[in-house]
Amino acid sequence: VPTATLVRVVGTELVIPCNVSDYDGPSEQNFDWSFSSLGSSFVELASTWEVGFPAQLYQERLQRGEILLRRTANDAVELHIKNVQPSDQGHYKCSTPSTDATVQGNYEDTVQVKVLADSLHVGPSARPPPSLSLREGEPFELRCTAASASPLHTHLALLWEVHRGPARRSVLALTHEGRFHPGLGYEQRYHSGDVRLDTVGSDAYRLSVSRALSADQGSYRCIVSEWIAEQGNWQEIQEKAVEVATVVIQPSVLRAAVPKNVSVAEGKELDLTCNITTDRADDVRPEVTWSFSRMPDSTLPGSRVLARLDRDSLVHSSPHVALSHVDARSYHLLVRDVSKENSGYYYCHVSLWAPGHNRSWHKVAEAVSSPAGVGVTWLEPDYQVYLNASKVPGFADDPTELACRVVDTKSGEANVRFTVSWYYRMNRRSDNVVTSELLAVMDGDWTLKYGERSKQRAQDGDFIFSKEHTDTFNFRIQRTTEEDRGNYYCVVSAWTKQRNNSWVKSKDVFSKPVNIFWALEDSVLVVKARQPKPFFAAGNTFEMTCKVSSKNIKSPRYSVLIMAEKPVGDLSSPNETKYIISLDQDSVVKLENWTDASRVDGVVLEKVQEDEFRYRMYQTQVSDAGLYRCMVTAWSPVRGSLWREAATSLSNPIEIDFQTSGPIFNASVHSDTPSVIRGDLIKLFCIITVEGAALDPDDMAFDVSWFAVHSFGLDKAPVLLSSLDRKGIVTTSRRDWKSDLSLERVSVLEFLLQVHGSEDQDFGNYYCSVTPWVKSPTGSWQKEAEIH
């Protein structure tokens, strides 16, 4: 059994171990226990062998389970006495009744047990433990009282423990030997003095935490144990615990407020105040950061820090920015010389830091303000814009010139420059919304960008944008089209120079629109023809003048075509129109369908004035009879040397009609051989008859032509066989077969066609065509109408 006296406290459990060694008997040993109170004999207490061994007093306690034997090995046992009482103080003897056959050594051993009254008082035991509500960084202390009135020299040990849910942690312990032991995770805080354990008076033990952390939340217990020294060894005689308090760490209230909307003039100072509201009044230190974002969301990338006041009150800021504080609750951001780039959203970010152990700091609260929307208003340049048209088109293709003038009253300084944008808006035809089209826009660096409408025409040089004076911007359309008609306006932008030498647009001023318009009336072209000498005879010169007038045609030039409408013998057929001679807008003459080789120089067309033309036809013939007209086309200049047809008009007709009682000629065909055999001679007569005035045969001449529609091609056009002109010259067409042709005048009015050695191809229908020529009184030959 243990050699030292065992000391226990009333109500605790007494456990005495006993073991036997160096024996020869059975391996499982039996043990008897006896008890002797001071000065009395031993009384049987319990046995592992003999059921009837215990005295009556102990039988009941054994049955109740207050006393029991627990075998721990074959050679060892423990005596357990629960709820030990003062009457249990005395000597306990353990013996082995059946170890060896012969006595060899010590078969019993005795240990003294002292039972002390419970003189350990631990508190507070009154009331359930209080709940301490505090904030992170705040101090707290807990007290536990422990006192022992033991007559023996005992030491107390104390442990502070915190429970958080199922987890249990040791905070700080004071051992019975007077040593402090910080729990796991509390070492640093203990060594820095943040967590301390000390005594107050003779029996109070104080746990002090100078800076509460969120991890300090939980239920705190004070565990007190009482120790006694027996023969140089310390043994714990009892332990008591008490719930002291529940610590709740409340989150700190922290709010940062900035003005919602602020307007500041360009170049002035922006002064924003961040007001802090907090329930912390202890030695927490604020860290204030002002940041800026283009968007009303401080979490988005692109947010940048402008200034920061750290917890040591040191300011870190960017140029033109200052941060100051009037008091611990008000922080000013000052941005000097603001410009447009300072427009945006400003945030105040506040962190509260509480001092921790070893000069460390920990954040106890954090807040970000709502954004302060800052708008930078301009010290606007004061100017007006006037647009006027220095050239207004009267017609399509005329030039248009617009001048956009800046009348600037207060913006002469070097840090303001002007640029222009030109816009076009179609004339409204209805209530439909008509959007403006950008023609050109000038950037702050005066680079010009064209709109879709004007890109190509600007590249072609038709649209010209220029700046001819410091205060005037010009826009020229070289050739204005009908599509260009509409409203034009200019927008002059003022640009302000920034600190970084960039230019930022500060104002736009719109001109009133200028309407470019001309009446799109139809072009009118009127041509009047007249005959200066209305009466003339065949052989005389025919003269006709054409006078042209026009409206709504710009810078017209005229081209003229003389045309004749000649009657055809068959009344059911339309008249035949012949183009005779023309004169283009550059006064170049061209013979059209004038085919009379003998009269190549017989027609003349000339420009008398810009709007008057004269046609002359020399040595007129009866065959020239007909209706004569001028067809006039008006042309407008386009792009320099090019011309655009503007209108065409026909003059009234001038008639050439020879009123004569001259002869009437007829022609007929006769053949003596209407049926022939191949190889025979075919004889065909063209006989002319003259009615009316008798003519001298010398005053008559004829052009005679023979045609045939051969039997092998009755559906074909007639084929010219041979002709004899009025001067007696015979012309014969080439033939693909062997027969020959001859044509001769056999009398004044008879012409004979002979086919020699006729072949099958010569069979068919033959006819003659006669053009009479009659000598006029003036001696000129007049061509008569062709007869068949």
Epitope: G123, P124, A126, R127, P128, S131, R143, T145, R206, S219
Partner: antibody
Framework: QLQLQESGPGLVKPSETLSLTCTVS??????????WDWIRQPPGKGLEWIGT???????YYNPSLKSRVTISVDTSKNQFSLKLNSVTAADTAVYYC??????????WGQGTLVTVSS | DVVMTQSPLSLPVTLGQPASISCRSS???????????LNWFQQRPGQSPRRLIY???NRDSGVPDRFSGSGSGTDFTLKISRVEAEDVGIYYC??????????FGQGTKLEIK
């Protein structure tokens, strides 16, 4: 038989400090089993708990009065005290001291009326 | 803080008749240790309060057995089986489960009809 007796001035001027002492007889104030409390009752009104102290020095106060209250203990004299500063007419009341155990407030003093008036 | 609300605030009773006072708490008074720390006090005219009941239903020594307490969670009741003349006064409930602060009800005045 445990007895508690309040003592102190019955009249206090506004803005001054109200000071009361509770003397405990028939038992030790240094018992680990008890808290020592102060309660007040304005005339014609209900009871309001002010605060408590444990002999080891732990104090707990009503948050509504915390900034103005101090409770202390003198174990050698078996007394505990109340100090309430910056008083106003609203602090006029009968002030009671009491013993608190795990079952509540079992013993009360007979109370003392403190009037705040200039 | 836990708010204690008593009803009725005034209770006129005929001698010999039963009386019942209700006390309701703003949160449960069950402590983590399983106990409910609720007291009932009697304050006779011109006297200090005297504890009648502790831990909801336990009568203090010397308190007549006509007084009984009951309830759980947030609803508690003090019953007087037969009212006697000496029972006249103001009755208060008090909780010390969740403290600080210890809180009282506003009081119920019992008077004889």
């Amino acid at each position: 038989q445990l007895q508690l007796q309040e003592s102190g001035p019955g009249l206090v001027k506004p803005s001054e400090t109200l000071s009361l002492t509770c003397t405990v007889s028939g038992g030790s104030i240094s018992s680990s089993s008890y808290y020592w409390d102060w309660i007040r009752q304005p005339p014609g009104k209900g009871l309001e708990w002010i605060g408590t102290i444990y002999y080891g020095g732990s104090t707990y106060y009503n948050p509504s009065l915390k900034s103005r209250v101090t409770i202390s203990v003198d174990t050698s004299k078996n007394q505990f005290s109340l100090k309430l500063n910056s008083v106003t007419a609203a602090d006029t009341a009968v002030y009671y001291c009491a013993r608190g155990n795990s079952y509540g407030l079992d013993y009360w003093g007979q109370g003392t009326l403190v009037t705040v008036s200039s | 803080d836990v708010v204690m609300t008593q009803s009725p605030l005034s209770l006129p009773v005929t001698l010999g008749q039963p009386a019942s006072i209700s006390c309701r708490s703003s949160q449960s008074l069950v402590h983590s240790d399983g106990n409910m720390y609720l007291n009932w006090f009697q304050q006779r005219p011109g006297q200090s309060p005297r504890r009648l009941i502790y831990k909801v239903s336990n009568r203090d020594s010397g308190v007549p057995d006509r007084f009984s307490g009951s309830g759980s969670g947030t609803d508690f009741t003090l019953k007087i089986s037969r009212v006697e003349a000496e029972d006249v006064g103001i009755y208060y409930c008090m909780q010390s489960t969740h403290w600080p602060p210890v809180t009282f009800g506003q009081g119920t005045k019992l008077e004889i009809k």
